[in-house]
């Protein structure tokens, strides 16, 4: 059967018949954006819509993490009729919309990347004029933030029998592989730990017994470059203590 | 964890009403999304009744139109399927289901069985 | 309304073996957004429908990968590599490209 009727919201003549499109959204993002730690990086989202010519308030959201639940990092809200998304959150200040949701465009802007930036995001845009309808994301754009090796902690530590052990750990992307040098060594990849759980940049190398004085090195290295760092092991002979 | 869960009377005399309620727990009904029932007649035949979206406007079966209305009440978290005038052929299993802006029902409630019978 | 055709009715397997069930629309099902809203679930004795396959190809979050979905305009195939003894139970496809959304009749899997 066909039906004609008035739709009061647009006061347009609509047909409906038996079988009709489903209103439905669409976005549009990749599925990776890759950038360098200190640099910026823009994620791409657009969107159609099934509402014609929406013109009432809108807000546009990024969530990090998860959809629908996930953090926030930056929402914005434009008035009626306005092309002016004013920002309400901008986490640490890093985020700027670049796209015009009006013109259907939530392309998001991120400062000064950090590794911890490398996570899935999730744009999102709510109409909340006369219509009333939303939309998210359900796959998201993943941030993959590249680094070069950076070492961030390098340590010497008591060992059961006043032996010794020492300790690197650095981070970087893709993860460095970490390598130990120093007193009748050569070089070394000793012990290297898998990156611990919820720190997927961090490795960590252990030497487990350190035999002689003198100076250790670590060096840590990926394709983007190396970074290295050392101790010094001085015991105390006749005495338990050690300095390094 | 989002938990979706039917009620309803079980037993109904044809030509009367049917009222089933299902409860959500762990997600807003108003937040998001549509909130859909199903119903699956015995022979496994499952058929799309209808949905309420968290805005509140509603989109039914054509053809179940004239004798199906889904409600809500937002202060308990509930969404509500009456169908008016049945007949056995409404005896059948009715999900409440959420469907997520991509077309998908991620989240069903467990079922309940409801018989048309004099 | 869209009907949505599966077969076979009944698809005997032995656990290991590969397994495909085709889904046919009675009209196309790409939405005027560009997308294809055809879902798979997966409705296991005594249970509700679980979904597997949503917008022809996405696996849903927690299945395995040993479930995978084709097809565009009206016809769509769901293949499973490897049955395993906890996908034994009834497989629907379903659009919501189309007010009223339609599911397919079942196609159940069985073992031998």
């Known amino acids: 059967f066909v039906r004609t009727k008035i739709d009061t919201t647009e006061n347009l003549l609509n047909t409906e018949v038996h079988s009709s499109p489903a209103q439905r959204w669409s976005m549009q993002v990749p599925p990776e954006v890759s950038a360098e730690a200190g640099d910026a990086a823009v994620l791409p989202c657009t969107f159609t819509h099934p509402h014609r010519h929406y013109d009432g308030p809108l807000t546009a959201i990024w969530r990090a993490g998860e959809p629908y639940a996930g953090p926030q990092v930056f929402r914005c809200a434009a008035a009626r009729g306005s092309e002016l998304c004013q920002t309400a959150l901008s986490l640490h200040g890093r985020f700027r919309l670049l796209g015009n949701p009006r013109r259907n465009d939530l392309s998001l802007r991120v400062e000064r990347l950090a590794l911890a930036d490398d996570r899935r995001y999730f744009c999102r845009v709510e109409f909340a004029g006369d219509v009333h309808d939303r939309y998210e994301s359900r796959h998201g754009v993943r941030l993959h933030v590249t680094a070069a090796p950076r070492i961030v902690n390098i340590s010497v530590l008591p060992s059961p029998a006043h032996a010794f052990r020492a300790l690197c750990t650095a981070e970087g992307e893709p993860p460095p592989a970490l390598a130990w040098s120093g007193p009748a060594l050569g070089n070394s990849l000793a012990a290297v730990r898998s990156p611990r759980e919820g720190h997927g940049h961090l490795v960590t190398a252990e030497l487990p017994a350190l035999t002689h004085d003198g100076r250790y090195t670590c060096t840590a290295a990926n394709s983007l470059g190396r970074s290295e760092a050392s101790v010094y092991l001085f015991r105390f002979h006749g005495a338990s203590g050690a300095s390094t | 964890d989002v938990q979706l869960q039917e009620s309803g009377p079980g037993l109904v005399k044809p030509s009367q009403s049917l009222s089933l309620t299902c409860t959500v727990t762990?997600?807003?009904?108003?937040?998001?999304?549509?909130w859909n029932w199903i119903r699956q007649f015995p022979g496994n035949k499952l058929e799309w009744m209808g949905y309420?979206?968290?805005?509140?406007?509603?989109t039914y079966k054509p053809t179940l139109k004239s004798r199906i209305s889904i409600t809500r009440d937002t202060s308990k978290n509930q969404f509500f399927l009456q169908l008016n005038s049945v007949t056995t052929e409404d005896s059948a299993t009715y999900y409440c289901?959420?469907?997520?802006?991509?077309?998908?029902?991620?989240?069903w409630g467990q079922g309940t069985t409801l018989t048309v019978t004099s | 309304d869209v009907l949505m055709t599966q077969t076979p009715l009944s698809l005997p397997v032995s656990l290991g073996d590969h397994a495909s069930i085709s889904c046919r629309s009675s009209?196309?099902?790409?939405?005027?957004?560009?997308?294809?809203?055809l879902d798979w679930y997966l409705q296991k004795p005594g249970q509700s429908p679980k979904l597997l396959i949503y917008?022809?190809?996405n696996r849903f979050s927690g299945v395995p990968d040993r479930f995978s979905g084709s097809g565009s305009g009206t016809d769509f195939t769901l293949k499973i590599s490897r049955v395993e003894a906890e996908d034994l139970g009834v497989y629907y496809c379903?659009?919501?490209?189309?007010?009223?959304?339609?599911f397919g009749g079942g196609t159940k899997l069985e073992i031998k």
């Open positions: 289901a959420r469907e997520d802006y991509d077309g998908l029902f991620d989240y």
């Open positions: 762990g997600y807003s009904i108003t937040s998001d999304f549509a």
């Open positions: 309420i979206r968290f805005s509140g406007s509603t």
């Open positions: 009209q196309t099902i790409l939405h005027s957004n560009g997308n294809t809203y």
């Open positions: 917008k022809v190809s």
């Open positions: 379903f659009q919501g490209s189309h007010v009223p959304y339609t």
